[in-house]
């Protein structure tokens, strides 16, 4: 059912990284516009992205209110220039999104190595604690603030002169690893949430090598 020349949205997809969350859908509109609504399972519907010709809607402001809630969105289709028009059932044509739980499903963004500091045969590698758009008491929370001990990092490293790699784990944002004196090393990190079954790992950070800015070295 539906009004003439109006088609329902389809392929509703959540795209979310570090809680920045956008709902995308198809098709590109021809003589129609869209409005999005979002709600928690028990909450009221809230309208966003009114009468837009875009095929995406940023819902970050809504989901960051409680990232552990499960959200549902729906996309309404209206004829362009006649947004009061309804379908044959007396309401606009719409399509539901899959459910989305930000805490369990947001992708982990690519981490960044903030610094490394060598003291003798030890190197301390620090991972930047990425800021998210989740707020508490009017301040933005970091990834660690949100995930706590659920968040870990995996370090991959090698001597600059060798292809053989090693790995280390931490559930903080710091690694302390043993290195050979006089050798330079290259590092990359990956974020991980061990308790998840999907979207568990981030992509690797850019590789950072000793002797190329970033670090401090003390004998």
């Amino acid at each position: 059912s539906g009004t003439t020349n109006t088609v329902a949205a389809y392929n509703l997809t959540w795209k979310s990284t570090n809680f920045k969350t956008i709902l995308e859908w198809e098709p590109k509109p021809v003589n129609q516009v869209y409005t999005v609504q979002i709600s928690t399972k028990s909450g009221d519907w809230k309208s966003k992205c009114f009468y837009t010709t875009d095929t995406e809607c940023d819902l970050t402001d809504e989901i960051v209110k409680d990232v552990k809630q499960t959200y549902l969105a729906r996309v309404f289709s209206y004829p362009a220039g006649n947004v009061e028009s309804t379908g044959s059932a007396g309401e606009p044509l719409y399509e539901n999104s899959p459910e989305f739980t930000p805490y369990l499903e947001t992708n982990l963004g690519q981490p960044t190595i903030q610094s490394f500091e060598q003291v003798g045969t030890k190197v301390n590698v620090t991972v930047e604690d990425e800021r998210t758009l989740v707020r508490r008491n009017n301040t933005f929370l970091s990834l660690r603030d949100v995930f706590g001990n659920d968040l870990g990092y995996i370090l991959t490293y090698r001597k600059s002169s060798s292809s053989g790699k090693k790995t280390a784990k931490t559930n903080t944002n710091e690694f302390l690893i043993d290195v050979d004196k006089g050798e330079n090393y290259c590092f990359s990190v990956q974020a991980v949430i061990p308790s998840r079954t999907v979207n568990r790992k981030s992509t690797d950070s850019p590789v950072e090598c000793m002797g190329q800015e970033k670090g401090e070295f003390r004998e």
């Epitope: 870990g152 995996i154 090693k166 280390a168 784990k169 991980v192 079954t197 999907v198 568990r200 790992k201």
Partner: antibody
């Protein structure tokens, strides 16, 4: 449910090669680190190496580096262990295991490899 | 590389006894230590992870403690089905290393 099934073991002559497979079901290997572990008859467990199937990164115990190669085919959800220049001391049961970052939570049943002339 | 020294290598105890196995790491492994049980012809089974956490479905008579370099695995009241070989595994950094194993028998 989650399952890992190894195959490809058998009897092989010293100096030859063998490729073991580990077929995963119930999850996507690219979401996890995957490992190979072996156990010689009557001996303890020995870690061989790991792969991050998402990007192909591999890390080995140095004693296996160069002779053993871990790879993955994400489209087949399968892990591989290529073993070259095999020696009698490589005789063992070979296990693949899934790593959830805090522990190896699932293991295969193991596939036996015998290196003998 | 981190060495794991597990002791004892074998142990004989009676049903109902308290059994303790230790693993000592050559450096701080920050609790990245697991304990596995292995029965003949079977794959290892996870009992304890992150040094102290009991794996799902594992009886509460099994426990783990420790931090830094020293770790302990305890069976509070030995049962006949606990006859197996037990291994510790450090996975804080590569190469990951297992202890040599402790073969547990019932007297």
């Amino acid at each position: 449910q989650v399952q890992l099934v190894e195959s490809g073991g058998g009897v092989v002559q010293p100096g030859r090669s063998l490729r073991l497979s580990c077929k995963a079901s119930g999850f996507n290997i690219k979401d996890y680190y995957m490992h190979w572990v072996r156990q010689a008859p009557g001996k303890g467990l020995e870690w061989i190496g790991l792969i991050d199937p998402e990007n192909g990164n591999t890390i080995y115990d140095p004693k296996f580096q160069g002779r053993f190669t871990i790879s993955a085919d994400n489209s087949k959800n399968t892990l591989f262990l290529q073993m070259d220049s095999l020696r009698p001391e490589d005789t063992a049961v070979y296990y693949c295991a899934r790593d959830n970052s805090y522990y190896f939570d699932y293991w295969g049943q193991g596939t036996p490899v015998t290196v003998s002339s | 590389d981190i060495q794991m020294t597990q002791s004892p290598s074998s142990l004989s105890a009676s049903v109902g006894d308290r059994v303790t196995i230790t693993c000592k790491a050559s450096q701080d492994i920050r609790k990245y230590l697991n304990w596995y049980q292995q029965k003949p012809g079977k794959a290892p089974k996870l009992l304890i992870y992150y040094a102290t956490s009991l794996a799902d479905g594992v009886p509460s008579r099994f426990s783990g403690s420790g931090s830094g370099t020293d770790y302990t695995f305890t069976i509070s009241s030995l049962q006949p089905e606990d006859i197996a070989t037990y291994y510790c595994l450090q996975h804080g950094e590569s190469p990951y290393t297992f202890g040599q194993g402790t073969k547990l028998e019932i007297t």
